[in-house]
């Protein structure tokens, strides 16, 4: 080994070196949280970049760059260090127009803490392993969601556009003429029935067990879907999103109530099956796989 490499190895294995890097990263993170940093922080920024460059140079000199099994670029954690340094110099010396977008990559410096703290490294390793193991479960989940999304599409397509429309129109008004002139929320409230405090028109349906309109209103299919048009089963993608909402139980009871009011209470069966299969079974299957991966990593 050359004297330079011997020195690099000595520095690299020294505990103070690890402490210095960790302190640098933490200080850098503190500086990154500043809202309006003063001018002198620019020099501090250069210092941080210098320390990171020094760290990488030491690692390269001690282990070699990329040829050989234990060299710098053969360790995935060093890829992060390399990217951090490359972006630090890119944003400083190369004029790339939208610098603010590139400055976002400075946040990657915070991730360097993972490679420095051994405990974190283990946890992240386990997380990556669990993601690999999750692929099969994810395929199953997406498949199940797709199947139920297609069923939902067939059962409820267009149903959430059913609204209670005012019957007593002016003598020359028609549904179409009104829809063409409606602009504001206030205009909508004149012609559609809204429950107090509701931001969407009251849903209704055409089957005997679906929601009925109050006196003076009739059920029509017109306008957009509830929740600014985001809640519907009108296309496969919207149906898939609705099913994902059910699986994650994200305000699912609202979707359940809306759909049952528009389609009929019989369709409760669909929701029971989805909640049992998607929410109770698949979610717990995912958790089980993650738990197994952590257990394996610990062993």
């Amino acid at each position: 080994f050359s004297p330079l490499r011997r020195i690099s190895i000595k520095i690299l294995v020294h505990s103070l070196f690890s402490m210095l890097i960790m302190c640098t990263i933490l200080t850098n993170c503190i500086f990154m949280t500043m809202n309006n940093p003063p001018d002198w922080t620019k020099n501090v920024e250069y210092t941080f970049t210098g320390i990171y460059t020094f760290e990488s140079l030491v690692k390269i000199l001690a282990r070699g760059f990329c040829v050989g099994e234990f060299t710098f670029l053969r360790d995935p954690w060093n890829w992060l260090d390399f990217v951090v340094i490359v972006f630090a110099y890119l944003t400083e010396f190369v004029n790339l127009g939208n610098v603010s977008a590139l400055r976002t990559f400075r946040v990657l410096r915070a991730l360097k803490t993972i490679s420095v703290i051994p405990g974190l490294k283990t946890i992240v390793g386990a997380l990556i392993q669990s993601v690999k193991k999750l692929s099969d479960v994810m395929i199953l989940t997406v498949f199940c969601l797709s199947v139920f999304a297609l069923i939902g599409l067939q059962l409820f397509m267009g149903n959430l556009k059913h609204k209670c429309f005012r019957n007593s129109l002016e003598n020359n008004e028609t549904l179409e003429s009104i829809m063409n002139t409606l602009e504001s929320e206030e205009d909508f409230r004149k012609y559609f029935y809204y429950l107090e405090g509701s931001k969407d028109a009251l849903l209704c349906g055409f089957s005997t067990d679906s929601g009925q309109c109050p006196e003076g209103y009739t059920c029509v299919k017109i306008g957009r879907n509830p929740d600014y048009g985001y809640t519907s089963f009108d296309t496969f993608s919207w149906a898939f999103l609705a099913l994902f909402r059910l699986m994650t139980q994200d305000y699912w009871e609202n979707l359940y109530q809306q759909t049952l009011r528009a389609a009929g209470k019989t369709y409760m069966i669909f929701f029971v099956v989805v909640i049992f299969l998607g929410s109770f079974y698949l979610i717990n299957l995912i958790l089980a796989v993650v738990a197994m991966a952590y257990e394996e990593q610990n062993q």
Partner: nanobody, 124 residues
Framework: EVQLVESGGGVVQPGGSLRLSCAAS????????MRWHRQAPGKQREFVAR???????GYADSVKGRFTISRDNAKNTVYLQMNSLRPEDTALYYC??????????????????WGQGTLVTVSS
């Protein structure tokens, strides 16, 4: 496809009576309001009477007390009973309805539908 067909028109003497009917056909799920309009020769179309699905009614001032609108929800039909007819009631009578129906492909559509009209002539 939804169709509205009017019938019952004809020639009648002043002071006489006529009963117009308008039947809606097709894969109808719900009929909201149903209205009668009329258009005299060389004049604009004017509203005559309306009835909602919960049987609330409304009339034009010119026919109040003389005309009565009713509907049979089971038959998807609206009727216009016209009494004490006057020569100025001579016109082509149109039926209009707000219909929600199941259209091709099984999807639901709501819209305003019109009939072809039935001619009522009041003359001595």
């Amino acid at each position: 496809e939804v169709q509205l067909v009017e019938s019952g028109g004809g020639v009648v003497q002043p002071g006489g009576s006529l009963r117009l009917s308008c039947a809606a056909s097709g894969r109808i799920l719900r009929i909201g309001y149903m209205r009668w309009h009329r258009q005299a020769p060389g004049k604009q179309r004017e509203f005559v009477a309306r009835i909602t699905d919960d049987s609330a009614t409304g009339y034009a001032d010119s026919v109040k007390g003389r005309f009565t609108i009713s509907r049979d929800n089971a038959k998807n039909t609206v009727y216009l009973q016209m009494n004490s007819l006057r020569p100025e009631d001579t016109a082509l009578y149109y039926c209009e309805a707000l219909v929600t129906a199941s259209v091709r492909g099984g999807s639901i559509h709501s819209g305003t539908y019109w009939g072809q009209g039935t001619l009522v002539t009041v003359s001595s």
